[in-house]
């Protein structure tokens, strides 16, 4: 029950997180005009990953897309890439985790397969969250650097009475959405990984079974069966026999008194 709850909660938290990452990526307010210590402006500037906007006091808002690809700063391109990778990984993670949910029955899917899928989606959510946090943090660092650079040259061309105020940009709402969303996706991923441990069967079938051939004392060791799902190699064996079966870790490589019937 606790495992199902943990898995379900992890899924929901990750879903909210990924929705937030998508929202942050699409938002225009990654950087907003710094109004502190500035004249009260009738024109408010803000920028996103894909376009820059101007909101006038008249209520008119005008946005212009960045129609160049090569002319954009490498850092902005890197942030875009990180956010897209985060979204893609998150989306795949969500897809995988839907099938991994304990409350959903798909054919005769084994618990071990569900455990693998849960772990895979968990890892994907963790990487997705980290990508989003990294992307937002890179952009924030870029803003901080530019902010202090423009503060240093705040007033350029002080020829006579004329002043040209450089527009300084500060953190926009999208950064906070991105940080929170990345954190939620990360937490959701960790919860999925925790749920995976509870989903995985504690015991597996015998790895080495001895058959007493009549008149002979020969040990027969068949190659242990692995329930492979393609979602990872660290799989546990399916439990077929309860009577004193042991996990892979307990299997000894040398003959013991348990090897013979």
């Amino acid at each position: 029950m606790a495992v199902t709850a943990c898995q379900g909660l992890g899924f929901v938290v990750s879903l909210i997180g990924i929705a937030g990452i998508i929202a942050a990526t699409c938002m225009d307010q990654w950087s907003t005009q710094d109004l502190y210590n500035n004249p009260v402006t009738a024109v408010f500037n803000y920028q996103g990953l894909w376009r820059s906007c101007v909101r006038e006091s008249s209520g008119f808002t005008e946005c212009r897309g960045y129609f160049t690809l090569l002319g954009l700063p490498a850092m902005l391109q890197a942030v875009r890439a990180l956010m897209i990778v985060g979204i893609v990984l998150g989306a795949i993670g969500l897809l995988v985790s839907i099938f991994a949910l304990k409350c959903i029955r798909i054919g005769s899917m084994e618990d071990s397969a569900k455990a693998n899928m849960t772990l895979t989606s968990g890892i994907m959510f963790i990487v997705s969250g980290l990508c989003a946090i990294a992307g937002v943090s890179v952009f924030a660092n870029m803003l901080v650097t530019n902010f202090w650079m423009s503060t240093a040259n705040m007033y350029t061309g002080m020829g006579g009475m004329v002043q040209t105020v450089q527009t300084r940009y500060t953190f926009g709402a999208a950064l906070f959405v991105g940080w929170v969303a990345g954190g939620l996706t990360l937490i959701g991923g960790v919860m999925m990984c925790i749920a995976c441990r509870g989903l995985a069967p504690e015991e597996t079938n015998y790895k080495a079974v001895s058959y007493h051939a009549s008149g002979h004392s020969v040990a027969y060791k068949p190659g242990g069966f692995k329930a492979s799902t393609g979602f990872g190699s660290n799989t546990k064996n399916k439990k077929i026999y309860d009577g004193g079966a042991r996990t892979e870790d307990e299997v000894q490589s040398y003959p013991s008194k348990h090897d013979y019937v």
Partner: antibody, heavy 119, light 113 residues
């Protein structure tokens, strides 16, 4: 046809109060930022106050704390409550509309209402 | 506050003449976000409220004759009337639309010679 009609002006003693009204018609009043601009007896134009669609309010420093701009979108009316009036507030008060695509320029002006502050 | 300085204060012209008046702002009215200048020109005829002629420093308001041309960027702006007509005799004001307070210039009075 866009029309802005001001009313409420008159003669008032220093320290007195007056409330100006501006009735807008021929446009969706709630979709526009509105302002009050005055013209002094020396014919200088002076912006007084602005109220945006999002109800952000801006005032000229010399009227801050004395004047209050407000709007009633249901009545298509803009108001300017003027308290603690001074002689320097004597002017012709215009109600103006900021054009939506005119880079914050005032595309329509009323005929104005005269305010005289004198003892 | 942004100070708008207009020159000359008055101009005496003959009909058909080309007229140029200037407006200087104490701070740049060019917005870096969209590379637009937030400056407007108004025409005020006796007994009438001001009328918008030019916005964004160079865009003519609809219905304004094409003899009126606005130019300039940053802090220096110009209003040119290519061929003055009798009905153009008025006071012309420039206005900062970028920063509050939305200040006006003192005006340039266009008179007939």
């Amino acid at each position: 046809e866009v029309r802005l009609v001001e009313s409420g002006g008159g003669l008032v003693k220093p320290g007195g109060s007056l409330k100006l009204s501006c009735a807008g018609s021929g446009f969706t009043f709630s979709s526009y930022t509105m302002s009050w601009v005055r013209q002094t007896p020396e014919k200088r134009l002076e912006w007084v106050a602005t109220i945006t669609i999002g109800v952000n309010i801006y005032y000229l420093d010399s009227v801050k704390g004395r004047f209050t701009i407000s709007r009633d979108n249901a009545k298509n009316t803009l108001y300017l409550q003027m308290n603690s009036l001074r002689s320097e507030d004597t002017a012709l008060y215009y109600c103006t509309r900021l054009g939506q695509t005119q880079r914050n320029a005032m595309d329509y002006w009323g005929q104005g209402t005269s305010v005289t502050v004198s003892s | 506050d942004i100070v708008m300085t207009q020159s000359p204060t008055s101009l005496s012209v003959s009909a058909g003449e080309k007229v140029t008046m200037t407006c200087k702002s104490s701070q740049s009215l060019l917005n870096s976000g969209n590379q637009k200048n937030y400056l407007a020109w108004y025409q005020e005829k006796p007994g009438q409220p001001p009328k918008l002629l030019i916005y964004g420093a160079s865009t003519r308001e609809s219905g304004v004759p094409d003899r009126f041309t606005g130019s300039g960027s940053g802090t220096d702006f110009t209003l040119t009337i290519s061929s003055v007509q009798a009905e153009d005799l008025a006071v012309y004001y420039c206005q900062n639309n970028h920063f509050y307070p939305l200040t006006f210039g003192a005006g340039t009075k266009l008179e007939l010679k």
